[in-house]
């Protein structure tokens, strides 16, 4: 439905508050280095303009596309060239090339200072003094650090952020009330950002069909009672929403997400019995709740898949005449029967089925050729099952920190060219799969673990794409979206790697380590571990364990010493010498 003024249409649909918030998110995700005040000024100008268009849709420039309006506004930033360098060249382009250019310059790892949390009283004062600015600043700081954060979901986080301050700043013990809530929001926010980053990577690097296949599998697991036509409609709508958000079209995305939530709730009887509670909530909570809703129960009397997908005489005809529909139905039918499989496994099975049909259908006896296709699935199913079993056993034996360390060593040996901060960040996140998923019963372990690993490995892929250093990483990241995890799992020690020169400075520590939080101290130790492996890639587990145990003892000893700095200087030298001897450096 065409509107005379797109900006007026979205302003009316979303309301002023959400409109302003979404424009701020959009601008902060594009111009990640711009100061908060500059963005607020731009947002206010856009909002005032939108209001004039609401009053008169025929007013000057109101017929322009949102990309044109927003792009023109971003290109008025005076410091564009000195702050962003070649990104300023985007402004010489016309739409839609200009927006594509801005998208290509989004930085997954912007050079921004770490967000330091002020004292609770300071935060509460700021919240009370100017609630609107305080919340806008939250949106701005998250959006610029996470340029692909799912914008309508960020509005939900901001609502929870506001609620936490509203409640806790009145509490007797403000810190006890607020800090756990902020920790939870931070952790959930990071997870949400990473999940959305995978969706955008899927769309941008592998195309709409890859995303749709993922969505068919996931929604079929979640809504196994829904008909294929219903799932297909939801997939089409969901794809539109995520395509818009990943493309920077945040107003359209938020509007369409609200429409999708409305549709789902109006049709929940034909979708899922689990949606009732979600659908009673306000919009932002409703959309979030639907996105996280548990899988509905599987229909009791589902027939064997073989009838339609192996035994039917029309298998090859159906495949050849409409692959998207036929393979979509296969994926739907398989996924609704297997909530115990990861989405990526289901996609691998569908790809195997497709490849087999493509190979067999032109043969003299197609049925004979593809009759055993389901037998080909067995090793594909067993591979992640065995991997998860082994790693959960290792996790239960070691605990999270040491399990992370085992993964750090494993991944540094596989891809030692990758930067140490990236290896630490990714391996720590990979290690979290243990506490996240190993507690689940067998039937929930694989979807939890393998789909989570897909999200984490995508972080590695997007960080590596910015500064490519390893052909092996590039290969695993680009060849197949669904085979990324098996590709990384299959990598052995990189025999071509030339060990890094030993640098004593890398292993020099100071008394400031003693005041760090437990998490920060772990990161310091894990950074040292990665560097050790880069110096000595052939070091055994035992050698590395001995050095790390000595290192932990050294930190503990010096942090208890009266003259900490002297202890770190003197004992540090001894530790470096002993470690070099132990590792034969």
């Amino acid at each position: 439905d065409a509107h005379k003024s797109e900006v007026a249409h979205r302003f009316k649909d979303l309301g002023e508050e959400n409109f302003k918030a979404l424009v701020l998110i959009a601008f902060a995700q594009y111009l990640q280095q711009c100061p908060f005040e500059d963005h607020v000024k731009l947002v206010n100008e856009v909002t005032e303009f939108a209001k004039t268009c609401v009053a008169d849709e025929s007013a000057e420039n109101c017929d322009k596309s949102l990309h044109t309006l927003f792009g023109d506004k971003l290109c008025t930033v005076a410091t564009l060239r000195e702050t962003y360098g070649e990104m300023a060249d985007c402004c010489a382009k016309q739409e839609p090339e200009r927006n594509e250019c801005f998208l290509q310059h989004k930085d997954d790892n912007p050079n921004l200072p770490r967000l330091v949390r002020p004292e609770v009283d300071v935060m509460c004062t700021a919240f009370h003094d100017n609630e609107e600015t305080f919340l806008k600043k939250y949106l701005y700081e998250i959006a610029r650090r996470h340029p692909y954060f799912y914008a309508p979901e960020l509005l939900f986080f901001a609502k929870r952020y506001k609620a936490a301050f509203t409640e806790c700043c009145q509490a007797a013990d403000k810190a006890a009330c607020l800090l756990p809530k902020l920790d939870e929001l931070r952790d959930e926010g990071k997870a949400s950002s990473a999940k959305q980053r995978l969706k955008c990577a899927s769309l941008q690097k592998f195309g709409e069909r890859a995303f749709k296949a993922w969505a068919v599998a996931r929604l079929s697991q979640r809504f196994p009672k829904a008909e294929f036509a219903e799932v297909s409609k939801l997939v089409t709508d969901l794809t539109k929403v995520h395509t818009e958000c990943c493309h920077g079209d945040l107003l359209e995305c938020a509007d369409d997400r609200a429409d999708l939530a409305k549709y789902i709730c109006e049709n929940q009887d034909s979708i899922s019995s689990k949606l009732k509670e979600c659908c009673e909530k306000p919009l932002l909570e409703k959309s979030h709740c639907i996105a996280e809703v548990e899988n509905d129960e599987m229909p009791a009397d589902l027939p064997s898949l073989a009838a339609d997908f192996v035994e039917s005489k029309d298998v090859c005809k159906n495949y050849a005449e409409a692959k998207d529909v036929f393979l979509g139905m296969f994926l739907y039918e398989y996924a609704r029967r297997h909530p115990d499989y990861s989405v990526v496994l289901l996609l691998r099975l569908a790809k195997t089925y497709e490849t087999t049909l493509e190979k067999c259908c032109a043969a003299a006896d197609p049925h004979e050729c593809y009759a055993k296709v389901f037998d080909e699935f067995k090793p594909l199913v067993e591979e992640p099952q065995n991997l998860i079993k082994q790693n959960c056993e290792l996790f239960e034996q070691l605990g999270e920190y040491k399990f992370q360390n085992a993964l750090l060593v494993r991944y540094t040996k596989k891809v030692p060219q990758v930067s140490t901060p990236t290896l630490v960040e990714v391996s720590r996140n990979l290690g979290k799969v243990g506490s996240k998923c190993c507690k689940h019963p067998e039937a929930k372990r694989m979807p939890c673990a393998e789909d989570y690993l897909s999200v984490v490995l995508n972080q590695l892929c997007v960080l590596h794409e910015k500064t490519p250093v390893s052909d092996r990483v590039t290969k695993c990241c680009t060849e197949s979206l669904v085979n990324r995890r098996p590709c990384f799992s299959a990598l052995e020690v990189d025999e071509t790697y030339v060990p890094k020169e030993f640098n004593a400075e890398t292993f020099t520590f100071h008394a400031d380590i003693c005041t760090l939080s437990e998490k920060e101290r772990q990161i310091k130790k894990q950074t040292a571990l990665v560097e050790l492996v880069k110096h000595k890639p052939k070091a055994t587990k035992e050698q590395l364990k001995a050095v790390m145990d000595d290192f932990a003892a050294f930190v503990e000893k010096c942090c208890k010493a009266d003259d900490k700095e002297t202890c770190f200087a003197e004992e540090g030298k001894k530790l470096v010498a002993a470690s070099q001897a132990a590792l034969g450096l």
């Epitope: 709409e208 050849a320 005449e321 692959k323 497709e354 493509e358 259908c361 032109a362 043969a363």
Partner: antibody, heavy 121, light 110 residues
Framework: EVQLVESGGGLVKPGGSLRLSCAAS????????INWVRQAPGKGLEWVGI???????FYATWAKGRFTISRDDSKNTLYLQMNSLKTEDTAVYYC???????????????WGQGTLVTVSS | AIQLTQSPSSLSASVGDRVTITCQSS???????LSWYQQKPGKAPKLLIY???KLTSGVPSRFSGSGSGTDFTLTISSLQPEDFATYYC???????????FGQGTKVEIK
């Protein structure tokens, strides 16, 4: 030597019919997916249709109903029956095999030399 | 409607030049079902590349293909005298009935 040889082309009036043949030597056509591809004079390539080893046929949307592909295994020959011919069907018609291991992909490796069909009054 | 658009429609180049031909598909091809053919006057086409980037056996390594989804490229790294010909891309889609070719790119001697 493995080869495909088309025949049966010639001049035909609009509305008329023609049957093209594609004879194979060195390969057993019944083990292959075979396509017909045409090329109007001075123009590009256009896929007409395919017959799989099993005998199942598929056609380009524009060819459905007018063109029929068949095969005679005893003669190791493929046919293209063309009815209700139009002037725009004037072209060189090639038969070509799909690369083994594929059924629906546009990978055509072995080609005949082509036969010219002219539809004109 | 399915469209496979090649550009340029013709180009002039010299022996030793690097030549790039693009093929744009709407909608995206199915599962990288994209091929490249070479055709010389009066002859049948010859398959050079399949699955967007795989070289058919016997085809010189100066030919290479890349791309996925909607955008594909054929590159001849160093044009040889025998490479002057017309090049076609071929695309496969969800329905076999939509199999189609680009309109061709004629590579001529400068």
């Amino acid at each position: 030597e493995v080869q495909l040889v088309e025949s049966g082309g010639g001049l035909v009036k609009p509305g008329g019919s023609l049957r093209l043949s594609c004879a194979a030597s060195g390969i057993d056509l019944s083990n292959y997916a075979i396509n017909w591809v045409r090329q109007a004079p001075g123009k590009g390539l256009e896929w007409v249709g395919i017959i799989w080893a099993s005998g199942t046929t598929f056609y380009a949307t524009w060819a459905k109903g007018r063109f029929t592909i068949s095969r005679d295994d005893s003669k190791n020959t493929l046919y293209l029956q063309m009815n209700s011919l139009k002037t725009e069907d004037t072209a060189v018609y090639y038969c070509t095999t799909t690369v083994p291991g594929y059924s629906t992909a546009p990978y055509f490796d072995l080609w005949g030399q082509g036969t010219l069909v002219t539809v004109s009054s | 409607a399915i469209q496979l658009t090649q550009s340029p429609s013709s180009l002039s180049a010299s022996v030793g030049d690097r030549v790039t031909i693009t093929c744009q598909s709407s909608p995206s091809v199915w599962s990288n079902f994209l091929s490249w053919y070479q055709q010389k006057p009066g002859k049948a086409p010859k398959l050079l590349i399949y699955e967007a980037s795989k070289l058919t056996s016997g085809v010189p390594s100066r030919f290479s293909g890349s791309g996925s989804g909607t955008d594909f490229t054929l590159t001849i790294s160093s044009l040889q005298p025998e490479d002057f010909a017309t090049y076609y891309c071929g695309g496969g889609y969800s329905s076999i009935s939509d199999t189609t070719f680009g309109q061709g790119t004629k590579v001529e001697i400068k």
